[in-house]
Structures are given as structure tokens and as C-alpha cells.
């Protein structure tokens, strides 16, 4: 078990010409939030397929209003990390989708509207417990900078979070067959759940469900002592009491193989069988060769026959990067006009047009409200190449399709009590207020004889009533 953590560093216009229009304006302030979706492996999957490894939604960022005439800057971001817990082993290779969403905060009573601003996707190799990996992805004219890592939740450790660690029971060393848990040298690897009945004294396991015997014991559950009649153990001094040789320390005791390598004794010493991605006498050197299949998306791996020589990936058309992990960003040419969102589908480019525009490249300007029905009795409001729905009570979202708790947006002002009603909502006003939403004080606070405005306020100044 563990947690995948994503830190968004910036979201703003990418380099090059054609800076995108700010998603927010003085007329329509907005704020950003992010969604991450994780899938195991490196398979090319549709964006809509399930987030099998998990998904997370960020908090909302600060409200942003564009300064008129200014280019779109990096937009204010939500605080904190996006965290995706995973219950099972970390797969090591994964696909991700990161979506940037805009929450529009117009003056409509119906609540905020959400729209997808940008979506980036990629496939990566990542070992749990490693350092933060930095990345930059582009979607159309937007650029997203972020870091990510996978970390194990105690007691799990290892590059896949499958080994378990527990505090040492004895101060000197770990139990039989158990290794110290680097980097937590004061902890020991906890025994896995071995095959039912496996002898706790004489058996151990490296995979759940198996039962491997310590020297001198045999049988499916390591409960049968090996015959001692010949006493032909090849090492160790004689025991004065039995006349047989007592096993001394072997070369694999304590398992000298790092990074999950398995140890086997040889006539002279020991040999480590290393997992993919590691080599060296003790599997202590991390290295990737062509045998590890490091080239994604059908890339051809050349060189790297031995760990000391680098490999090179020759990428097929449409992909780039040292591991062919990045699509060639054909969207960087900004083929979508009028603020359309560019999607590179590999076999084709697709433009997702902003409301009010249509055509393969969003080149046709539509009547904002033409053919755009607002559901559930909402009315369409034109403006700035984007249609907005002013929703009827009880509904929200961009097209008024989302059923809303009519009281969720605090629709009663000045401390009025909101009651959900089959026809919408009813506000019960606090004493001294009236109006359908209690928005009108009958006698504004402190307004004595003939001031030009309420005390402490210049006329035209705002005053907050909650």
C-alpha cells in the first residue's frame, strides 16, 4: 500500500507565439482545480477508461480575475498535493491523465459552472520510494509543470511497496531469513504471510503463500528435520555434544542482494539474481538495458546490450523523448482557432471547440445560444463567444443538467433560513429583512438622520452583509 503524490507547480501559457486567452475575466472571474487519473501499465487507453489505480481531485484554487489587456499569466493554483492512495503493489509503470478544470464564478444564482480547460496524458516508469520526478506537459497553448512520486505507507517498503517492515524485536539483528529494511536500518523486514502451517521457526517465504526451509529442515511445511546420520554438512565446526557439524554462517545469510534480488549459494561464494532494472554483484546498481524494454509506443531499442553502455530509442512517427514516451505535440502549432482545445489522438488531430464555435478547426462563429438548449427550464445568456445558462432553481452546472440542493449555495441573505421546497426554495428572513431572498434590509443598520450613505461608507462603497 502507498500513495501517489502529484504537486502542480504552474499552469499557464506555454512558450512560443499565440498566448492563450485568459480563462477568466473581470466579467467572469474563475478559479482552477485539477483532476488526476492513474492506470497501471503502459497501455494506450482511452481517456474515459476507468482510473484503475485511483483518481484524485484538488481543492479549488484562489479566485482569479484577468487584468484587462494583460496576457494570461500563470494562474493561481490550489494549495497542497493531489494524493492517490493505492492499496496493492505499486506497478512501477503507469499511465496518467491530468485535467485542468475551470470553475466559473459568474453572478448567476444557479451556482458555478465547470469546464475542462486542458488535459495532458503520459506513460512513465516510476519506482516507489524514489525522489520527486519533474515533468512538463503541453496541451495546446497551455503548459503544465508538475512533480510526482510514489511512496509506500508503513509498514510497506521497496520499489513496489510489497515488502513489509517492522521495528526490531532484538537490538542486534533481524530474525532468520529477514533483512534489515534499508533505509530504516533500525527496522527489519517483516515476515510475509507464508503458506498456512509453514513452520515459524524453520520456514520462511519470499512470496506470499510459499514455504521455504532453513538449512536442516525439509518438507512442505519445513517441519521435517533433514537426516543427520551422515553429518556431512560441508561447513562449520563439530558439535561436541552430537558429533555432527552445526551449520555456521552461510554466504547468503542476511541476504546480501539489494533491491529485491534473490541470493543463491555457489561453491565459492554467492550469486544474486537481480530484478529488472538492477545489476551488479549485489544488485546494487540501477541500470536499464534494452532487455528491460525501455522504449515505449513501439520504439526500437538500439545498443545497451550490456549495462555499461547506454541504449537509444528510435521512436516511431508521432512520438519523441528518450523513451518515446511523449507524443510529438502537433497541438503546439495551435491549429484550433477561437480558443478551441486541441487533442492529439495519434491518428488524427481533434479540436474541442468552445461554446459558440464549430468546425474542424473551430473556425465557424455560431450564434452563442443557437441550438444550445439549457436543460430543466434554464435560459441561455449570450456573451463573449460562450453561452451561459441561467438555471432554474434546483439545477446547476453549465447546461443546468445537474440537480442541485437549492439551499447549498446559501441563497438566503442576511442570515435568512433556507428551506428546500418541491417548487424550489423558501427563505425565512431574519427580523428586519425582506425580499424573496432576504436581500433587502428594511432599515439599513445605523442609518441615522440624513447621512449621505450608511455610516463609515462613501456612497457607492460596498458593505458586506452575510
Amino acid at each position: 500500500a502507498g500513495v501517489f503524490e502529484l504537486q502542480i507547480h504552474s499552469f499557464g501559457p506555454g512558450p512560443g507565439p499565440g498566448a492563450p486567452r485568459s480563462p477568466c475575466s473581470a466579467r467572469l472571474p474563475c478559479r482552477l482545480f485539477f483532476r488526476v487519473c492513474l492506470k497501471p501499465g503502459l497501455s494506450e487507453e482511452a481517456a474515459e477508461s476507468p482510473c484503475a489505480l485511483g483518481a484524485a481531485l484538488s481543492a479549488r484554487g484562489p479566485v482569479y480575475t484577468e487584468q484587462p489587456g494583460a496576457p494570461a499569466p500563470d494562474l493561481p493554483l490550489p494549495d497542497g498535493l493531489l494524493q492517490v492512495p493505492f492499496r496493492d503493489a505499486w506497478p512501477g509503470t503507469f499511465s496518467f491523465i491530468i485535467e485542468t478544470w475551470r470553475e466559473e464564478l459568474g453572478d448567476q444564482i444557479g451556482g458555478p459552472a465547470w469546464s475542462l480547460l486542458a488535459r495532458v496524458a503520459g506513460r512513465r516508469r516510476l519506482a516507489a520510494g524514489g525522489p520527486w520526478a519533474r515533468d512538463i506537459q503541453r496541451a495546446g497553448a497551455w503548459e503544465l509543470r508538475f512533480s510526482y512520486r510514489a511512496r509506500c505507507e508503513p509498514p510497506a517498503v521497496g520499489t513496489a511497496c510489497t515488502r513489509l517492515c517492522r521495528p526490531r524485536s532484538a537490538p542486534s539483528r533481524c530474525g532468520p531469513g529477514l533483512r534489515p529494511c534499508a533505509p530504516l536500518e533500525d527496522e527489519c523486514e517483516a515476515p510475509l504471510v507464508c503458506r498456512a502451517g509453514c513452520s515459524p521457526e524453520h520456514g520462511f517465504c519470499e512470496q506470499p503463500g510459499e514455504c521455504r526451509c532453513l538449512e536442516g529442515w525439509t518438507g512442505p511445511l519445513c517441519t521435517v528435520p533433514v537426516s543427520t546420520s551422515s553429518c556431512l554438512s560441508p561447513r562449520g565446526p563439530s558439535s561436541a555434544t552430537t558429533g555432527c557439524l552445526v551449520p555456521g554462517p552461510g554466504p547468503c545469510d542476511g541476504n546480501p542482494c539489494a533491491n529485491g534480488g534473490s541470493c543463491s549459494e555457489t561453491p565459492r561464494s554467492f550469486e544474486c539474481t537481480c530484478p529488472r532494472g538492477f545489476y551488479g554483484l549485489r544488485c546494487e546498481v540501477s541500470g536499464v538495458t534494452c532487455a528491460d524494454g525501455p522504449c515505449f509506443n513501439g520504439g526500437l531499442c538500439v545498443g545497451g546490450a550490456d549495462p555499461d553502455s547506454a541504449y537509444i530509442c528510435h521512436c516511431p512517427p508521432g512520438f519523441q523523448g528518450s523513451n518515446c514516451e511523449k507524443r510529438v505535440d502537433r497541438c503546439s502549432l495551435q491549429p484550433c482557432r477561437n480558443g478551441g482545445l486541441c487533442l492529439d489522438l495519434g491518428h488524427a488531430l481533434r479540436c474541442r471547440c468552445r461554446a459558440g464555435f464549430a468546425g474542424p478547426r473551430c473556425e465557424h462563429d455560431l450564434d452563442d445560444c443557437a441550438g444550445r438548449a439549457c436543460a430543466n427550464g434554464g435560459t441561455c445568456v449570450e456573451g463573449g463567444g460562450a453561452h451561459r445558462c441561467s438555471c432554474a432553481l434546483g439545477f446547476g452546472g453549465r447546461d443546468c443538467r445537474e440537480r442541485a440542493d437549492p439551499c447549498a449555495a446559501r441563497p438566503c441573505a442576511h442570515g435568512g433560513r433556507c428551506y428546500a421546497h418541491f417548487s424550489g426554495l423558501v427563505c425565512a428572513c431574519a427580523p428586519g429583512y425582506m425580499g424573496a431572498r432576504c436581500e433587502f434590509p428594511v432599515h439599513p443598520d445605523g442609518a441615522s438622520a440624513l447621512p449621505a450613505a450608511p455610516p463609515g461608507l462613501r456612497p457607492g462603497d460596498p458593505q458586506r452583509y452575510l
Partner: nanobody
Framework: EVQLVESGGGLVQPGGSLTLSCAAS????????MAWYRQAPGKKRELVAG???????DYIDSVKGRFTISRDNAKNSVYLQMNSLRAEDTAVYYC???????????WGQGTLVTVSS
Amino acid sequence: EVQLVESGGGLVQPGGSLTLSCAASGSKVSFLSMAWYRQAPGKKRELVAGISADGSKDYIDSVKGRFTISRDNAKNSVYLQMNSLRAEDTAVYYCYAYRWTTRLTYWGQGTLVTVSS
């Protein structure tokens, strides 16, 4: 920031009519709840009429049937049509706006209405 500018005040004889206008900037009036208040010399400011963002209207009892509040979204303005004016309607009339997104209230500078023969 919402700015409100009133106009249309003046001197009128009892029984006469007057229309007050309030032009808003900084937000659409269709998104605001707006009202007219008045303050007579030596008295507290009081609500006269209000129009909520959803279009529902409210009036104090003393002006029901005589005053009408309305909204023109195209002109981004709110109006108060005052008929059958009486001497007790003499006051400074203020435009008021309540902005739902910020929960802030805004006031205009006021326009004087004098009903006298």
C-alpha cells in the same frame, strides 16, 4: 466593483408622477438584487421597493399600488415609477444593489425628490 448612479429626482406637485433611474456598472442588473430606499429629513433610511435577481418584487405598504419597480437588462438599469405622489414621499432616494457572488451591498449617491405645492 459595482457603481450605481441615480437620476430623475426633482420638484413635483402632490398627485404628480416621477420616474427615478439607477444605472449600474460593474455587473449585470439581472444578476443583482436591487432596491430603492429613501431617507426623509430627521428619519431613518427605509426600504421602498426591491426587485430580486429572480425578478420577484417587494414594496412597503405605504407605496403599494402607487410605485412600481422595474428592470431593463439591456440598459443595465433599474427604475422606480412613482405616481400619486404625496408630501410624505419627500426624501432623498437611494439606489441599492446586493451582489450574490460576493454578498456585498452597494449604494448610490442619492437623488432628491421634493413633493410640494
